[in-house]
Interface confidence: low
């Protein structure tokens, strides 16, 4: 009689995570008598998956009734597959022996590959805000996917970015993989409403990629421009000077008026107006009693925006001249060492 062969007809099986894997195995003969065992991996380090003779294997069910006398179908189903179940599975026939059964013949093996979806990409930006023209880095991470092949793209407001580096880990074979990408984005003054998007495409997603987003409003700081102007006379000996604070973001801003270097009033931006680009404008005014000053008055509008070094703009008010003749002095004073002059 022809010697028993163990047939594993499927060289590979592909299963989505959470589904049930069917691993097929048949024997060509009933002889010799003895049980079938399933292993993951081969050699001394292999892992027992199912033993027909004994043991408890809650995730494994047999396709056929192995207690039937003439059964030669030793296929099994493994439920709730996870990426950790990936590997080569061997159907092994044992010959009844004393005291122990002896391995007799093995099937050629079935490679179980598990497809697992990547987690939703998480995009994170820099810890500190940055100003326009600066380059900032955003990271995108997604985990738990299999197989390893994956595509990651970056977008800013729908426009694909090219300056990024991506790593898929681990470098070798693994039950599942993680992707980590860092993109560099140059900020512009119009980026308050901008979004950075990380898009991950994987075979498990059936052409519907996952996206993670970050709002540049969390990252950008647009410093204000200041303009100090003198308004027409409101009353005899009184001059109204306004400080226009334009195009700033975020809203956190404190303004201080100084008369000849002495603090006159400090206020916090409250009723701001929002521009289309998401930046804010604000105006503060100071009523100066000219008759109270013997000499010329230097009025300074000093602004501290979002905890940054103060920037200021001054206006010279000549007491001797008629208030209506005063124009705006455009000379800027910069009290912040890290800020450029704002005109």
């Amino acid at each position: 009689e022809e010697e028993l062969q163990v047939i594993q007809p499927d060289k590979s099986v592909l299963v989505a995570a959470g589904e049930t894997a069917t691993l097929r195995c048949t024997a060509t003969s009933l002889i010799p008598v003895g049980p079938i065992q399933w292993f993951r991996g081969a050699g001394p380090g292999r892992e027992l998956i199912y033993n027909q003779k004994e043991g408890h294997f809650p995730r494994v069910t047999t396709v056929s009734d192995l207690t039937k006398r003439n059964n030669m179908d030793f296929s099994i189903r493994i439920g709730n597959i996870t990426p950790a179940d990936a590997g080569t599975y061997y159907c092994v026939k044992f010959r009844k022996g004393s005291p122990d059964d002896v391995e007799f013949k093995s099937g050629a093996g079935t490679e179980l590959s598990v497809r697992a979806k990547p987690s939703a990409p998480v995009v994170s930006g820099p810890a500190a805000r940055a100003t326009p023209q600066h380059t900032v880095s955003f990271t995108c991470e997604s985990h738990g996917f299999s197989p390893r092949d994956i595509t990651l793209k970056w977008f800013k407001n729908g426009n694909e970015l090219s300056d990024f580096q991506t790593n898929v880990d681990p470098v070798g074979e693994s039950v599942s993989y993680s992707i980590h990408s860092t993109a560099k984005v140059v900020l512009t003054r119009e980026d308050v409403h901008s979004q950075v998007i990380c898009e991950v495409a994987h075979v498990t997603l059936q052409g519907d990629p996952l996206r993670g987003t970050a709002n540049l409003s969390e990252t950008i700081r647009v410093p204000p421009t200041l303009e100090v102007t003198q308004q027409p006379v409101r009353a005899e000996n009184q001059v109204n000077v306004t400080c226009q604070v334009r195009k700033f973001y975020p809203q956190r801003l404190q303004l201080t008026w100084l008369e000849n270097g002495n603090v006159s009033r400090t206020e916090t931006a409250s009723t701001v107006t929002e521009n289309k680009d998401g930046t804010y404008n604000w105006m503060s005014w100071l009523l100066v009693n000219v008759s109270a000053h013997r000499d010329d008055v230097k009025l300074t509008c000093q602004v501290e925006h979002d905890g940054q070094p103060a920037v200021s703009k001054s206006h010279d008010l000549k007491v001797s001249a008629h208030p209506k003749e005063q124009g705006s002095n455009t000379a800027a004073e910069n009290t912040g060492s890290n800020e450029r002059n704002i005109y």
């Epitope: 991470e141 070798g172 693994s174 993680s178």
Partner: antibody
Framework: QVQLQESGPGLVRPSETLSLTCTVS????????WSWIRQPPGKGLEWIGF???????FYNPSLKSRVTISLDTSKNQFSLKMTSVTAADTAVYYC????????????????WGQGTTVTVSS | DIVMTQSPLSLPVTPGEPASISCKSS???????????LDWYLQRPGQSPQLLIY???NRASGVPDRFSGSGSGTDFTLKISRVEAEDVGVFYC?????????FGGGTKVEIK
């Protein structure tokens, strides 16, 4: 218990090729990285490279142009070939098993061979 | 490449006393999964290196509990709570985060 045993010539002529084999006994090749590390006399350890059980290789960039690591799973062996050797390649060469089961990184080089001394001299 | 810097270079110890070795990496070995991929090895005189600690703080199988690893990011420490005579040798740290794997220069522990 897994054991590693290096084998190969102890003396290699300059400009020739160094060839070493590591035999793995008492365990499986599968699911590990198989590494080569060297130690010049009186100096520290230098990683040469490793091969994963699926055949993927990774090398130290400083040696990459001269090094090849290969794997023969049927014999439970992996090998190192280093071309164009010089006296600077004189060292004790270790083969080792590197675990990898936590994701991105490696989880310890837990089994080492006893090392084989290779002298490059004419 | 990640550069690993160990200190001190040499450490004279008294049996029964504690000892501590520092290892610094040129970039963080802490990955987003929470693991710090740093190993500690001991190479006794005339022997192969032996794994003591992996992932910064996990003791390898069979390693006595007098050895402990700590640290995260770029600064790591190996502590021996009570030095024994068999602990003499050269201790190496190694980063296992990315290739090429790189070792520290070693710390030679010797009995006073």
């Amino acid at each position: 218990q897994v054991q590693l045993q290096e084998s190969g010539p102890g003396l290699v002529r300059p400009s020739e090729t160094l060839s070493l084999t590591c035999t793995v006994s008492g365990g499986s090749i599968r699911n590990y990285y198989w590494s080569w590390i060297r130690q010049p006399p009186g100096k520290g350890l230098e990683w040469i490279g490793f091969i994963y059980y699926n055949g993927r290789t990774f090398y130290n960039p400083s040696l990459k142009s001269r090094v090849t690591i290969s794997l023969d799973t049927s014999k439970n062996q992996f090998s190192l070939k280093m071309t164009s050797v010089t006296a600077a390649d004189t060292a004790v060469y270790y083969c080792a098993r590197v675990r990898a089961y936590s994701g991105i990184g490696l989880d310890g080089t837990d089994v080492w061979g006893q090392g084989t001394t290779v002298t490059v001299s004419s | 490449d990640i550069v690993m810097t160990q200190s001190p270079l040499s450490l004279p110890v008294t049996p029964g006393e504690p000892a501590s070795i520092s290892c610094k990496s040129s970039q963080s070995l802490l990955y987003s999964n929470g693991y710090a991929y740093l190993d500690w090895y001991l190479q006794r005189p005339g022997q192969s290196p032996q794994l003591l600690i992996y992932q910064g703080s996990n003791r390898a199988s069979g390693v006595p509990d007098r050895f402990s690893g700590s640290g995260s990011g770029t600064d790591f420490t190996l502590k021996i709570s009570r030095v024994e005579a068999e602990d003499v040798g050269v201790f190496y740290c190694m980063q296992a985060l990315q290739t090429p794997l790189t070792f520290g220069g070693g710390t030679k522990v010797e009995i006073k």
